[in-house]
Each structure stands twice: as structure tokens, then as C-alpha cells.
């Protein structure tokens, strides 16, 4: 019989990994550069995808066990990898807060249409941060 | 139980353009899942060369020459490989991974194809 | 390029026990699958990147990973188990990638 699977982590404790890893970081992984990918087309997979190469990195090994672990799930999970962009490299701290930004809006809305909506959500959490501040 | 099957020429001549075609019964092709080509020379190893699923993803050897297509009407999915060469002369399988991580866990029994004018 | 490496050539006697192993630095992040192909046949997988036995495949076969090596062990050697095995792993570049593939040798 299969080997016993561990359970997939839920979006909640994702998304608390990458605002862990993020907080108060200007870099990850040495400034290291990876792909930027389109999130909208599996985003697990996808960010998946543009990490594998990361190694020897301890930052982000938790957040790669919990991209593979979401991407082994199912199709019925929609976790398909995107047609990968060769264009355009990022740091990883950049794709991990893309990744971050996008997951939210899973979280909160259900879903999320793009990178329109990446932007979107960044201008709210941008005005939500400034708000707070002036206010406190 | 899900089968696929590799049609092809068998043989094509030196600058010509390969067309094979996988029919998949059983089953249904569609953007759920990795719909691959993999080929294997002459006593050498395995070479994966691209999947479709929804998208395309093509191993960056064949980039330029290479074009996987699916038609989910006829239930199969297609590849076409440009400027052949005598070292195109492979066995060229099809076949189907269930999630992106998890492996090819359907194959085709493979067709061969020989390029020799 | 990446690169996925196998030992070329493993040998054991009936009842016996081998291990296969495959090296690459993305093995760590998303571990490997491991196909066998017998001679003249297409290959099969046989244990996926989550250690995962494919059904139908004997418990004889395992798959384990530690750092940035995979192994595949078959225990209970059977001559039917004489083929070629293949991992398989991820490159951000290049896909999918095959390792060169492990001959294994049933002796006497």
C-alpha cells in the first residue's frame, strides 16, 4: 500500500509562513534571482516551479515543503503549472511577497482573476498599512 | 483503464517535419492533466520534450522546433518536431501525469521513428 | 545544464537486496519518481516523489530520500525485476529531467 501522505497545509498557515519569512526583509537567499511566473495558472505549482533551483537556503525551505505539498494535490485542486515565462527574473524575496499578495486574496475573496488583481490588492494593503499607522 | 497510443510515419527523411499523434481511451484529455512527449534514442536514456495542459511547457533542447497541440474533441493530443535530423531517429512514447510532481503514471507503448533519406 | 546522476550498472543475486541511488540538487525540494523499463518495453512508474508506491507495484520496492539524494531500494531480488530504472526529477529551466538510468543485473 501507498506510503501514508502528510496533510496539506491549509491557505491560513501558508500565508503565515510567508508574511514569517518576509517580515522585516529586504532579501532572501542571498539576493538569489528566479523566474517570475504567472501565479493565475496554479499558483502552487507555479511558484513551485520558479523555487525548485533554490538550495542550500534554510529560509525558505518550510515555504517549498508547504508548495509541494499544495501542488501534489489533485487536479480537481486546479493546481496546474503555468507556461513558464522566460523574460523577466525577480529576487525571491519579491516572488515570495507576490506569492504572499496573491494567496490573501484566495484567502479573503475565493479567487483571483490576475495581475490586475495582485495590483489591486497591493494599493489596499499599501492604504490599509498607512491608514493603520496614522491612526495609531 | 486508461490507454494511450502513439501513431507516426515511422519514417521521415532529414529536414522534414515529424507529426505524431497520441489517442487516449478510457479517459478524457483535458487541462487537468500533463499531457507529455518523451523520447528514447538508441541505447540512451530518457528524454522528456514537453507536455501540454491548457499550456505548453517544452524542454529548451527542442525550443523553436517543437509544438505539442491537443484536440479534446477527438480525445488526443499531438507533436510536431521540425528540421529533423538523423539524430531525431528515437522511440517516441506518450504519456500522462496525474498531478505535476507525482510522475507519468500512463504510458503509451511508444512508436518507433527512423530519419534517413 | 542540470544534470540527474545514477550509477550506471547494479547487480544482485535472487532474493537479494540493491539499492539504486540519483543525486541532484532539486531532489531536496521535490524530491524524485522512479520508473523501471523492462527490456523493449515502455517505462513504469513505480514510486512517486512522496514515497508513494504506484498501485499494482510490489512492496518489495521503496523509494527514500535524504538532502539532495533519492534512492530507490527493491528487496527480495526476482528475475523479473532485471531492467532499466530511471529517476525523475524538476529543473526550473529545463522541466522534467531524467537521470541516465541504472542497469540491473539478476546474477545466476
Known amino acids: 500500500s501507498p506510503s501514508p501522505v502528510t496533510p496539506s497545509p491549509t491557505l491560513k498557515e501558508l500565508i503565515e509562513e510567508l508574511v514569517n519569512i518576509t517580515q522585516n526583509q529586504a532579501s532572501l537567499c542571498n539576493g538569489s534571482m528566479v523566474w517570475s511566473v504567472n501565479l493565475t495558472a496554479g499558483m502552487y505549482c507555479a511558484a513551485l516551479e520558479s523555487l525548485i533551483n533554490v538550495s542550500d537556503c534554510s529560509a525558505i525551505q518550510r515555504t517549498q515543503r508547504m508548495l509541494k505539498a499544495l501542488c501534489s494535490q489533485k487536479p480537481a485542486a486546479g493546481q496546474i503549472s503555468s507556461e513558464r515565462s522566460r523574460d523577466t527574473k525577480i529576487e525571491v524575496i519579491q516572488l515570495v511577497k507576490n506569492l504572499l499578495t496573491y494567496v490573501r486574496g484566495v484567502y479573503r475573496h475565493g479567487n483571483f482573476r490576475g495581475l490586475n488583481d495582485i495590483f489591486e490588492a497591493q494599493k489596499i494593503e499599501w492604504h490599509e498599512h498607512h491608514h493603520h499607522h496614522h491612526h495609531h | 483503464e486508461l490507454t494511450l497510443q502513439e501513431s507516426g510515419p515511422g519514417l521521415v527523411k532529414p529536414s522534414q517535419t515529424l507529426s505524431l499523434t497520441c489517442v487516449v481511451s478510457?479517459?478524457?484529455?483535458?487541462?487537468?492533466?500533463?499531457w507529455n512527449w518523451i523520447r528514447q534514442r538508441p541505447g540512451r536514456g530518457l528524454e522528456w520534450m514537453g507536455y501540454w495542459t491548457g499550456s505548453t511547457n517544452y524542454n529548451p533542447a527542442f525550443q523553436g522546433r517543437i509544438s505539442i497541440t491537443a484536440d479534446t474533441a477527438k480525445n488526443h493530443f499531438s507533436l510536431q518536431l521540425t528540421s529533423m535530423t538523423t539524430e531525431d531517429t528515437a522511440v517516441y512514447y506518450c504519456a500522462r501525469a496525474s498531478t505535476w510532481l507525482h510522475g507519468m503514471d500512463f504510458w503509451g507503448h511508444g512508436t518507433s521513428l527512423f530519419v534517413s533519406s | 545544464s542540470y544534470v540527474l546522476t545514477q550509477s550506471p550498472s547494479v547487480s544482485g543475486s535472487l532474493g537479494q537486496t540493491v539499492t539504486i541511488s540519483c543525486s541532484g540538487t532539486t531532489i531536496g525540494v521535490v524530491g524524485a519518481n522512479w520508473y523501471q523499463q523492462l527490456p523493449g518495453k515502455a517505462p513504469k512508474l513505480l514510486v512517486h516523489s512522496d514515497g508513494g508506491r504506484l498501485s499494482g507495484v510490489p512492496d518489495r520496492f521503496s523509494g527514500s530520500e535524504s538532502g539532495n539524494s533519492a534512492a530507490l531500494t527493491i528487496t527480495g531480488l526476482q528475475a523479473e525485476d532485471e531492467a532499466d530504472y530511471y529517476c525523475?526529477?524538476?529543473?526550473?529551466?529545463?522541466?522534467?529531467?531524467f537521470g541516465s538510468g541504472t542497469q540491473l543485473t539478476i546474477l545466476g
Open positions: 525523475q526529477s524538476f529543473d526550473t529551466t529545463l522541466g522534467y529531467v
Open positions: 478510457g479517459g478524457s484529455v483535458t487541462s487537468n492533466y500533463y
